[in-house]
Amino acid sequence: QEPGGLVVPPTDAPVSPTTLYVEDISEPPLHDFYCSRLLDLVFLLDGSSRLSEAEFEVLKAFVVDMMERLRISQKWVRVAVVEYHDGSHAYIGLKDRKRPSELRRIASQVKYAGSQVASTSEVLKYTLFQIFSKIDRPEASRIALLLMASQEPQRMSRNFVRYVQGLKKKKVIVIPVGIGPHANLKQIRLIEKQAPENKAFVLSSVDELEQQRDEIVSYLCDLAPEAPPPTLPP
């Protein structure tokens, strides 16, 4: 348990036996647009009942679609996938050494919680203290894509700004994606205020995710540095 009372969940969903993944035998790009940058990207999925199970499936499909457009590997774009309700459940960790297709498969398996509460404060705390506790790739950009469709109770949001500021100190960009009429616009505006890079996308429903996908991927990708050219021997 975290000092702040956060219960640390297991970091993996049931997956098939790990196959040896050789970084250099990468899978071919699936789309014309392909982000090859130095990026640590965390997907944070709202697991509240404000999204129906069908809508949650569309949300997952959006995450999988985004992952298809990233050059996922330990050298380039590392991804984590977390579903949050009153706690947080990590399905993929940044250091997971699996093929991109396997990571997409795991992302598609995220279970629908349909809980009464999805605490953005808890998941940002989790992101701060668990995912980015140690910065092991200082040269990469760090981004948390906060997919939010609900509002946490006020009692849970007391330390919200503190966690957003903590993430800012660790140079973690938070990009909120508000989905539907119940998304917490007040929290979205607070996140935006903390840093100019914290650009929000506000959508009226999950149906708009596909339309906005390329713009969101482009925005994330533009925030990340390109890999320096290989140094030539003298």
Epitope: E53, A54, V58, K60, A61, S108, Q109, V110, K111, Y112
Partner: nanobody, 122 residues
Framework: QVQLVESGGGLVQAGGSLRLSCAAS?????MAWFRQPPGKEREFVAV????????LVAASVKGRFTISRDNAKNTVYLQMTSLKPADTAVYYC??????????????????WGQGTQVTVSS
Amino acid sequence: QVQLVESGGGLVQAGGSLRLSCAASGRTKDMAWFRQPPGKEREFVAVIYSSDGSTLVAASVKGRFTISRDNAKNTVYLQMTSLKPADTAVYYCATSRGYSGTYYSTSRYDYWGQGTQVTVSS
């Protein structure tokens, strides 16, 4: 092993309606309809979730097709209205054991019915 049996297909004129049924031999989580037009790939039509009864329908049939289920009968229905010749296909019912793959991909679904032919004449 879940068994799925579709019924309700047939020949109908453009603008007409049909209701397809799919009876499952056991409890299912999500139940989906796919279709395969002649000479084309199998494509997603609609899905319904047992947890909350929520549904997704492909953009190409939105407003014309509705998916529903009767939990007591373990049966899912596809109500098709304003049918067009382009809707001509073999319609398949499918369900999955777990959630692996996106809702619209055939690879997600473990169990399939034998299919029922729908022909829409102009």
